[in-house]
Amino acid sequence: QHHGVTKCNITCSKMTSKIPVALLIHYQQNQASCGKRAIILETRQHRLFCADPKEQWVKDAMQHLDRQAAALTRNGGTFEKQIGEVKPRTTPAAGGMDESVVLEPEATGESSSLEPTPSSQEAQRALGTSPELPTGVTGSSGTRLPPTPKAQDGGPVGTELFRVPPVSTAATWQSSAPHQPGPSLWAEAKTSEAPSTQDPSTQASTASSPAPEENAPSEGQRVWGQGQSPRPENSLEREEMGPVPAHTDAFQDWGPGSMAHVSVVPVSSEGTPSREPVASGSWTPKAEEPIHATMDPQRLGVLITPVPDAQAATRRQ
């Protein structure tokens, strides 16, 4: 267990807009050393978002997740207290980060900065990697359900954290609630891969759960207020596509934000399926400022591939 200096693993430059708690599975608080306090939310698609702890919806979401975690515990759910370095999940899940999320490499002077191009939410889903919260992030304690990414979770734009493939140095996020559908928030966060000492009082508990039968695509997001976007039928769809750039507004404006995707599975930015317009309610991709994910690719041992966020643009065809 590490007992070194607690380092700010995740910094948030933007806060996400509203995300339904139904799409959230866990939350954590960033470290005090980060300066600006933020809540890091994880969606059922294992996407991370930065949220403002002062906002009522964030308070309500945390309460809801806490209740769920408590209910799980009462029903036999088990918690695994993890201090220091948390072992990553073994199963990769789709993951992505919002523009405002940045992963900081652990102890290496170098880092690669990603400037993701807009990626389709579906493409993100296709990534099959799940973001892991670095250790040192405190969170609600709860059991984590199987890290199976579900449909893309939509979320406010510009506040989603990038998903990071599980790496030995990455800490697993604790899930405060069972997997539930939830939009991905757009929050820029910098996540350092280096394990940091976690204050026991801020430790999050993680419940181990079975791995998904297969990688699920990253959460997709419709651009709220823009009507449904087509659903792509090609192979890059949900399972192979990633989140789309989103707005930084509320849930309805959750359009995916451009995010850099750290995926174990390289995803081509081309071939993003175009979706046919859907009856309604899909987000159109809005490219926002790219999120910069700084991390040492070698350390992660994964390919960091920016994926264009086009899901919102094409939901189903």
Partner: antibody
Amino acid sequence: QVQLVQSGAEVKKPGASVKVSCKASGYTFTNYYIHWVRQAPGQGLEWIGWIYPGDGSPKFNERFKGRTTLTRDKSTNTAYMELSSLRSDDTAVYFCATGPTDGDYFDYWGQGTTVTVSS
Amino acid sequence: DIQMTQSPSSLSASVGDRVTITCRASGNIHNFLAWYQQKPGKAPKFLVYNEKTLADGVPSRFSGSGSGTQYTLTISSLQPEDFATYFCQQFWSTPYTFGGGTKVEIK
């Protein structure tokens, strides 16, 4: 275009089970949640649960946990909802629906499958 | 669970009338509300999401508004094809719940 086509009407006896299918087309099946909603005669709508076709993981309304099974067959782009230990108050139209990934509202619906439970 | 209460349960109106349907949630659903229209023997049709965003192809005479626990669906000028039953649905938290429905009938 997105389409959800459900299986035909069923008449079952109390205590029996029923399995309703929902075949999806027009989009990538594994990318969107499939939800099941029921509507008793002259009543409102009740959410049963969802399944994520990508990995087969389900989530249920607690009211239906224990006697509802949600599955899918990716090779045929079909989702299934099986309800066991049927009672007369399970008589309803069962709908499958799918929605965006940024929130679970339902933009596409199947035509509905009427399940009648009667002795 | 969040309960959704719709009112009125039914109303009679004439073509051209302005109609307002209310949906009240037992807790704050943060605008994660959808509205559907259903005609006899048919599946619901998606109208509005996120409290006020119209689904594709939905006429502009429909509008949604509200916040917190109170939401409304307004039809500015009722048309013959609008006579149907309307349901609200919250998608803030699971289990997703629907209002009991409002039947809009011809006066």
